[in-house]
């Protein structure tokens, strides 16, 4: 019996087609992805093959103005329109709190939304009961397939799930649910989830009874043969893991941003064992036409976005200096504003030991593309912010050793004076440079704001200590020559859309007046 699994993950609000790098589509003839194009391909496959499942491995939420405005209603509407069969909860599905998940998505989705390792407690337990499930048995033709979901247990540090959801260890939570499916005589089981490729592989290895793992979170690109675009494969598609009980378990992921549609064909024997698996992600490029009906619906929903981008978010009573003459040479108040917003966006529940889990931000000055003049009545709009942060990036959470941070700050000024983009703006960090010294030895003082303290204060950076830092995904990926970050980071979790982080902060503050205050000397 053959099953075709179509899968997406980490779509992050890319409802419209995008450029090849998943930013805003500029030249339509070269654009990719988007739900209208995805629908065309999905329907093509549904028409050609008998047993097809369309699955999403989480993080539909967050990433463009679509999410900012529609807050998840767009996800439910268009996933319903594409007739998804199931979705796993990702960490970003909690970005607007549990209510921001329940109302727009859980109550509106016609497909099951899954996670076996999220347990509700307290008053939330009854409110959310049945709205998401640990697993679902799906009929496919004359057979049944069990889908069991999982979500990153780091979600409380990455999003806003509140205090009434417990995120358990994935493997511990999955095993009993898979066992339950087996007792229901379900012998074909897919683990669908959002914990990253390393955990996907562990699940394939450790959870008895899981036949296939469809993952997300790490934006992993797998491919067999010559890749069709810029993404470099992390391994073959599917990636085969030998389980502890000796089975070959295919593991797949489909990069991110709706650029590819994962396509996996699985052949099962009559006892539900995987006999063979093959496939590849399908690049959704302009050779695949956008479905006119879905496209028309997108255009209808688009109208509200255009109105939103000119509305006032808040006011500034000072000039927001985002000029390259400032931000690539010295501390600039636009850099301070953005870093403060980045930290504010990552405030999580404190405990008796930590006032917050992260206190530091770094931001390449070259990523700040425009100032904002306060003389326009102080008004700040989304449009203004899109000029400052035009690249559609995210502000991510990484864990780095102090020694890596020191290298990053040395890199920040290794060729100072040439107006290059690697000059770092900061938050929760005090850095002192001596530019008379030779490159690689210019950082003379580097103090960082404590997190394990009730009153935050600055302490000298410790080389062997592991620190959490918020930074643009561009830096996490080694951009602007920050190869040491990419090579030495111990953990990387993608965060929220850059403009959204700053706009939310400005809306919250209402009036802003960031200063240059001696963070960089």
């Amino acid at each position: 019996w053959e099953l075709t699994i179509l899968h997406t993950n980490d779509v992050h609000s890319r409802l419209e087609q995008t450029s090849e790098d998943s930013s805003k589509c500029v030249n339509a003839s070269r654009c990719m992805g988007g739900v209208a194009r995805l629908f065309t391909k999905v329907q093509q496959i549904r028409r050609a093959e008998p047993n097809v499942l369309l699955l999403d491995a989480g993080d539909q939420y967050q990433g463009t103005i679509w999410f900012t405005v529609y807050k998840g209603a767009e996800v439910a509407h268009f996933m319903n329109a594409l007739r998804y069969d199931a979705m796993a909860l990702g960490n970003h599905e909690f970005d607007n709190g549990v209510e921001g998940l329940i109302e727009p998505l859980l109550k509106e989705a016609k497909f099951p939304i899954l996670s076996a390792n999220i347990k509700a407690k307290g008053p939330l337990a009854s409110q959310i009961s049945g709205l998401y499930l640990p697993y679902k048995v799906l009929p496919v033709g004359d057979e049944v397939v069990g889908i069991v979901g999982y979500t990153s247990k780091e979600t409380p540090f990455l999003s806003n799930p509140g205090t009434n959801l417990v995120f358990e260890d994935e493997i511990t939570a999955l095993q009993p649910e898979v066992d339950k499916l087996k007792t229901l005589n379900v012998n074909k089981i897919i683990a669908l989830g959002h914990s990253g490729f390393e955990m996907d592989k562990l699940i394939a290895q450790k959870v008895r009874g899981v036949d296939v793992v469809v993952g997300g979170h790490s934006n992993t690109f797998l491919y067999t043969g010559n890749p069709p675009s810029k993404e470099v494969p992390a391994g073959k598609y599917p990636f085969i893991v030998t389980s502890d009980d000796g089975r070959k378990v295919p593991v797949v992921q489909a990069y991110a941003f709706g650029k590819y549609l994962g396509y996996l064909k699985i052949e099962f024997d009559e006892r539900g064992n995987v006999i063979s698996s093959h496939g590849n992600p399908i690049l959704l490029n302009s050779s695949i036409p956008e479905d006119p009906s879905i496209k028309a619906d997108i255009n209808k929903w688009r109208i509200k976005l255009d109105n939103y981008s000119t509305q006032e978010l808040g006011k500034t009573i000072v000039y927001l200096d985002g000029s390259s003459q400032s931000c690539r040479f010295r501390e600039c108040n636009m850099g301070n504003l953005i870093c403060d917003a980045m930290i504010n966006n990552n405030l999580r529940h404190a405990d008796e030991t930590f006032w917050n889990h992260v206190s530091m931000c770094i931001l390449n000055g070259g990523g700040i593309r425009s100032p904002i003049d306060e003389r326009n009545n102080g008004t700040i709009t989304w449009e203004n912010l899109a000029a400052v942060l035009p690249f559609g990036g995210t502000f991510d959470l990484v864990q780095l050793k102090g020694s890596t941070l020191k290298k990053a700050f040395e890199h920040s000024v290794h060729r100072y004076g040439q107006s290059t983009g690697e000059f770092l703006q900061v938050g929760g960090i005090h850095v002192v440079y001596d530019l008379s010294r030779k490159p690689g030895d210019r950082v003379v003082k580097l103090d960082v704001l404590c997190t394990k303290c009730r009153v935050p204060s600055y302490d000298p950076l410790k080389m062997d200590e592991v620190y959490k830092v918020i930074l643009p995904n561009f830096l996490a990926n080694g951009g602007d020559g920050f190869q040491m970050i990419k090579d030495e980071l111990l953990r990387h979790d993608s965060g929220d859309q850059d403009i959204n982080v700053v706009s939310t902060y400005i809306s919250k503050m209402k009036v802003i007046y960031p200063a240059v205050e001696g963070r960089i000397k």
């Epitope: 629908f39 329907q43 799906l138």
Partner: antibody
Framework: QVQLVESGGGVVQPGRSLRLSCAAS????????MHWVRQAPGKGLEWVAV????????YYPDSVKGRFTISRDNSKNTLYLQMNSLRAEDTAVYYC??????????????WGQGTMVTVSS | DIQMTQSPSSLSASVGDRVTITCRAS??????LAWYQQKPEKAPKSLIY???SLQSGVPSRFSGSGSGTDFTLTISSLQPEDFATYYC?????????FGGGTKVEIK
């Protein structure tokens, strides 16, 4: 082979009740949404009811809502339509039809031969 | 409710003719449209689903096209056994609705 066979039709007085059955064979009945569709003499097709594969949802058009009830017994591979408060305009051939195996609306790939229901005093 | 309007309501054609039947939805239904053939005193038979997919066993002279609100069923070369009534049906949303039918008669 895949087959649907309706039964239970007949002549009934207005205001009375009737229960139609549809016996399925040749496929995994419990995996499919099942529908009733009717056709009044000399008229077109009208959808009457759906029940999801797992019985979790049922939908009806306004014309029969509150009077007709669709149900199924997956252990017996049988679909039912309980028709109460019958009216003259319910006179039709009633077809049982197989839908898809998901929770989305679907088309009908397999039809029964139909059973005639006449509501007349 | 979504109204389905079929045209023409009847047509006369000869064997070998190319026949086109149209179906219009009162609102967008994407590609969630099916076509059925019904012969007198018989149950309907599925021809096409998802606007353009041929049901297995249906001759390739039948084809469907369209998306959104306007759809077409085409019989490329009418055969004697094709004289029947044809119905479209939307399955975008409940209640499911059918067109009024198009009767294809022998000229």
């Amino acid at each position: 082979q895949v087959q649907l066979v309706e039964s239970g039709g007949g002549v009934v007085q207005p205001g009375r009740s009737l229960r139609l059955s549809c016996a399925a064979s040749g496929f995994t009945f419990s995996n499919y949404g099942m529908h009733w569709v009717r056709q009044a003499p000399g008229k077109g097709l009208e959808w009457v009811a759906v029940i999801w594969y797992d019985e979790s949802n049922k939908y009806y058009p306004d014309s029969v809502k509150g009077r007709f009830t669709i149900s199924r017994d997956n252990s017996k591979n049988t679909l039912y339509l309980q028709m109460n408060s019958l009216r003259a305009e319910d006179t039709a051939v009633y077809y049982c039809a197989r839908g898809g195996s998901s929770w989305y609306p679907d088309s009908f790939d397999i039809w029964g031969q139909g059973t005639m229901v006449t509501v007349s005093s | 409710d979504i109204q389905m309007t079929q045209s023409p309501s009847s047509l006369s054609a000869s064997v070998g003719d190319r026949v086109t039947i149209t179906c219009r939805a009162s609102q967008g239904i994407s590609s969630w449209l099916a076509w059925y053939q019904q012969k007198p005193e018989k149950a309907p038979k599925s021809l096409i689903y998802a606007a353009s997919s041929l049901q297995s066993g249906v001759p390739s002279r039948f084809s469907g096209s369209g998306s959104g609100t306007d759809f077409t069923l085409t019989i490329s070369s009418l055969q004697p056994e094709d004289f029947a009534t044809y119905y479209c049906q939307q399955y975008n949303s409940y209640p499911l609705t059918f067109g009024g039918g198009t009767k294809v008669e022998i000229k």
